[in-house]
């Protein structure tokens, strides 16, 4: 029962995590304009992995896709790749784990097969979570580096007369969604791996064989060193890790100037 609960919970936590990774990858707020030095700006800039957006004083938001592939920074490409790999691995892991769930009967699938599938999906979830955490962390590091670089030369003189503030970017909501989602996927994967240990048959149960030694009538029962045969109640203490976190994405999109009715 504990194994089923651990496996089920691992699946649900991973499912939430992967949904979060997908959401984070699609979100536009990976980096948002730092308002510390310009809190009164009427033009607010924010950027995602796929496009950059500007919200104007009218409330209108315009987003432009990065239509170039070669012109993009290598780090951004790496982050995209990590997030996509994370999503793909997570999706495959979810597919595998559905068939591995103890509560779902598929033909005459043995527990050993389910255990292997649970372990496979668990590893996939762990790698998926790590990919997401790595991707988000790489992007965050890129932001921090750029932030301090732009702080160093924030004011660029215009003919020595007028100063213009260079736009600096700070952490956007997508980074926090990504970190939490990656963490949940990782926790879900660990739970699946723990569940796998409970699903796997821990010994081969031999039928008792009587060996008749001359002059003696003693029956030897090999394999008696294990307390549990796998059929009785499982007395082992299995920890169930519960990762409960909520993420919220409040993105408001606006119609274009020509979207008036």
């Amino acid at each position: 029962m504990a194994v089923t609960a651990c496996q089920g919970l691992g699946f649900v936590v991973s499912l939430i995590g992967i949904a979060g990774i997908i959401a984070a990858t699609c979100m536009d707020q990976w980096s948002t304009q730092d308002l510390y030095n310009n809190p009164v700006t009427a033009v607010f800039n924010y950027q995602g992995l796929w496009r950059s957006c500007v919200r104007e004083s009218s409330g209108f938001t315009e987003c432009r896709g990065y239509f170039t592939l070669l012109g993009l920074p290598a780090m951004l490409q790496a982050v995209r790749a990590l997030m996509i790999v994370g999503i793909v691995l997570g999706a495959i892991g979810l597919l595998v784990s559905i068939f591995a769930l103890k509560c779902i009967r598929i033909g005459s699938m043995e527990d050993s097969a389910k255990a292997n599938m649970t372990l496979t999906s668990g590893i996939m979830f762990i790698v998926s979570g790590l990919c997401a955490i790595a991707g988000v962390s790489v992007f965050a590091n890129m932001l921090v580096t750029n932030f301090w670089m732009s702080t160093a030369n924030m004011y660029t003189g215009m003919g020595g007369m007028v100063q213009t503030v260079q736009t600096r970017y700070t952490f956007g909501a997508a980074l926090f969604v990504g970190w939490v989602a990656g963490g949940l996927t990782l926790i879900g994967g660990v739970m699946m791996c723990i569940a796998c240990r409970g699903l796997a048959p821990e010994e081969t149960n031999y039928k008792a064989v009587s060996y008749h030694a001359s002059g003696h009538s003693v029956a030897y029962k090999p394999g008696g060193f294990k307390a549990s045969t796998g059929f009785g109640s499982n007395t082992k203490n299995k920890k169930i890790y519960d990762g409960g976190a909520r993420t919220e994405d409040e993105v408001q999109s606006y119609p274009s100037k020509h979207d008036y009715v």
């Epitope: 409330g59 432009r64 408001q252």
Partner: antibody, heavy 115, light 113 residues
Amino acid sequence: QVQLVQSGAEVKKPGASVKVSCKASGFTFTSYNIHWVKQAPGQGLEWIGYISPGNGGSNYNLKFKDRATMTSDTSISTAYMELSRLRSDDTAVYFCATGRGFAYWGQGTLVTVSS
Amino acid sequence: DIVMTQSPDSLAVSLGERATINCKSSQSLFNSGNQKNYLIWYQQKPGQPPKLLIYRASTRDSGVPDRFSGSGSGTDFTLTISSLQAEDVAVYYCQNDYSYPLTFGGGTKLEIK
């Protein structure tokens, strides 16, 4: 088509308050900020502030912050601007405006402050 | 606050001639996020609300005749009417759309010579 229809002219005494309305139609009211602009007789334009009907957020020109209050009622697609403690120099035409680059303006509401 | 300074205060141009109105801001209106300048030009005729001509310094609003054009970047901007028509007689305003409080120029009164 997009329309902003403002309330009629008002005559008020110094110290009183006035509430000007701006009814929007032809677009999704909650999608755009509604800005308010003052134009004193024979003078230029002065931005008062805006209300964001989508989330109720607002931003005021510090000059008007302590006397101007902007609200909106999304159920009837109407924005309001209330100006309290009126003075004679508040006599002006008040416009509401919206859209990208303030593409759409109300016809204006003349507020006369006179004792 | 960003101060918008328009010049000249008034301008008289012959019909069919070019009219040029200048606008200078005390701070740059350039947004590096999308490489655009956030300056707006309006036309206002007596008894009417202002009418949008140009936004983002050079983007003409729909329905605005192509004789109206906007140019400039950073702090210096220009509105040009390539061939003045009788219906262009009005007061023209520039506006900072980059930083709160949004501020307007003092206006330029355009007349026919």
